[in-house]
Amino acid sequence: MGKGDPKKPRGKMSSYAFFVQTCREEHKKKHPDASVNFSEFSKKCSERWKTMSAKEKGKFEDMAKADKARYEREMKTYIPPKGETKKKFKDPNAPKRPPSAFFLFCSEYRPKIKGEHPGLSIGDVAKKLGEMWNNTAADDKQPYEKKAAKLKEKYEKDIAAYRAKGKPDAAKKGVVKAEKSKKKKEEEEDEEDEEDEEEEEDEEDEDEEEDDDDE
């Protein structure tokens, strides 16, 4: 979340997230000074997760269960500060943040999961989609990544044009100051928009033992 209530309980982590965290720690121990190529690292993690047995995954699933319990426990006693629900102003004419490869993938398979499991909660649908993505090989993810990259490129052009045109009047003051803080601002926007993407997925409502939709 980055900015927000520091007292707010940390979000719950999935079994795969725990696995990736462990991978990162192992990598740091083995190569303390090496910089990590994030996409390569993610690919390797994903491939390793795919070939792990249910028994090996069990340890991480237990960690996720414990973390979920911790999160639920902490959320029971958490009181959000007043006005936390207010979202900051977003210009409706601003170019829309491009979807990630995972988001595009979700759009493909969400109807199937929801259709076959109508009683499933938004969170459970999202969890299934996450599992499916994590069990998808890099080659199979390629078309989604290609399209996401294309959309990102288009967004970057559009946002540059949008910024050049100038934002609504209130935002036009202090151009020099704005330039200095542009990089920091973009980083913050990245964070915020990742959150937005998650929210959008939830708003959209968010395995079959087998696919059970055969008529």
């Epitope: 070939t51 199937k112 069990n135 090989a137 080659d139 199979d140 078309p143 395995d207 079959e208």
Partner: antibody, heavy 122, light 107 residues
Framework: EVQLLESGGGLVQPGGSLRLSCAAS????????MHWVRQAPGKGLEWVSR????????WYADSVKGRFTISRDNSKNTLYLQMNSLRAEDTAVYYC???????????????WGQGTLVTVSS | DIQMTQSPSSLSASVGDRVTITCRAS??????LNWYQQKPGTAPKVLIY???SLQSGVPSRFSGSGSGTDFTLTISSLQPEDFSTYYC?????????FGQGTKLEIK
């Protein structure tokens, strides 16, 4: 009953084109990945192409990349394979098949159509 | 691409025999392996998916095992209708690849 029925095969000259169709029934077509798999006479099975549920994403075997195009019409419950620049080595029975997933996200092909024969010869 | 190698290519056996067909992947594929049966002039039919799960409607004399790179399909007691060609296939990544097939013939 879940069924897949291919059509459109036939005799075509090298360099020619052909469009195969696969009519699906008995399941929610728009939920599934669909594939084409071929089998040359007396030979084994070779995966050809795959398309995602909405039709927005496609995958191809190197042997057909740039020549074949997979597509689908979910409103008609139909899968297609447009084959251009056909070669003698494309001669085969072409099967359409559905990609099914287990609870652990392992994909397998079920069911398969009866196949349609494509012969590329002068 | 992941290469799938089946052995033997052909096999002669008698009704009642126990038969094992093996499949080896050129790299580790976890349990992303399926087995199909194909009778002459017909389409393939799935027998086993995810290395060891029996497809519904398939007789229990068929079983699958293995993970990583080595897999086996076992028919515990051959029946006359089992004489056909068997293929293994990996669904670990794209392109999906098949073994070259094992033809099971009557001795």
């Amino acid at each position: 009953e879940v069924q897949l029925l291919e059509s459109g095969g036939g005799l075509v000259q090298p360099g020619g084109s052909l469009r195969l169709s696969c009519a699906a029934s008995g399941f929610t077509f728009s939920y599934y990945d669909m594939h084409w798999v071929r089998q040359a006479p007396g030979k084994g099975l070779e995966w050809v192409s795959r398309i995602s549920p909405s039709g927005g994403y496609t995958w191809y075997a190197d042997s057909v990349k740039g020549r074949f195009t997979i597509s689908r019409d979910n409103s008609k419950n139909t899968l297609y394979l447009q084959m251009n620049s056909l070669r003698a080595e494309d001669t085969a029975v072409y099967y359409c098949t559905r990609g099914r997933y287990t609870s652990g996200w392992h994909e397998y092909f079920d069911p398969w159509g009866q196949g349609t024969l494509v012969t590329v010869s002068s | 691409d992941i290469q799938m190698t089946q052995s033997p290519s052909s096999l002669s056996a008698s009704v009642g025999d126990r038969v094992t067909i093996t499949c080896r992947a050129s790299q580790s594929i976890g349990t992303y392996l399926n087995w199909y049966q194909q009778k002459p002039g017909t389409a393939p039919k799935v027998l086993i998916y995810a290395a060891s799960s029996l497809q519904s409607g398939v007789p229990s004399r068929f079983s699958g095992s293995g993970s990583g790179t080595d897999f086996t399909l076992t028919i515990s007691s051959l029946q006359p209708e089992d004489f056909s060609t068997y293929y293994c296939q990996q669904s670990y990544n794209t392109p999906r690849t098949f073994g070259q097939g094992t033809k099971l013939e009557i001795k």
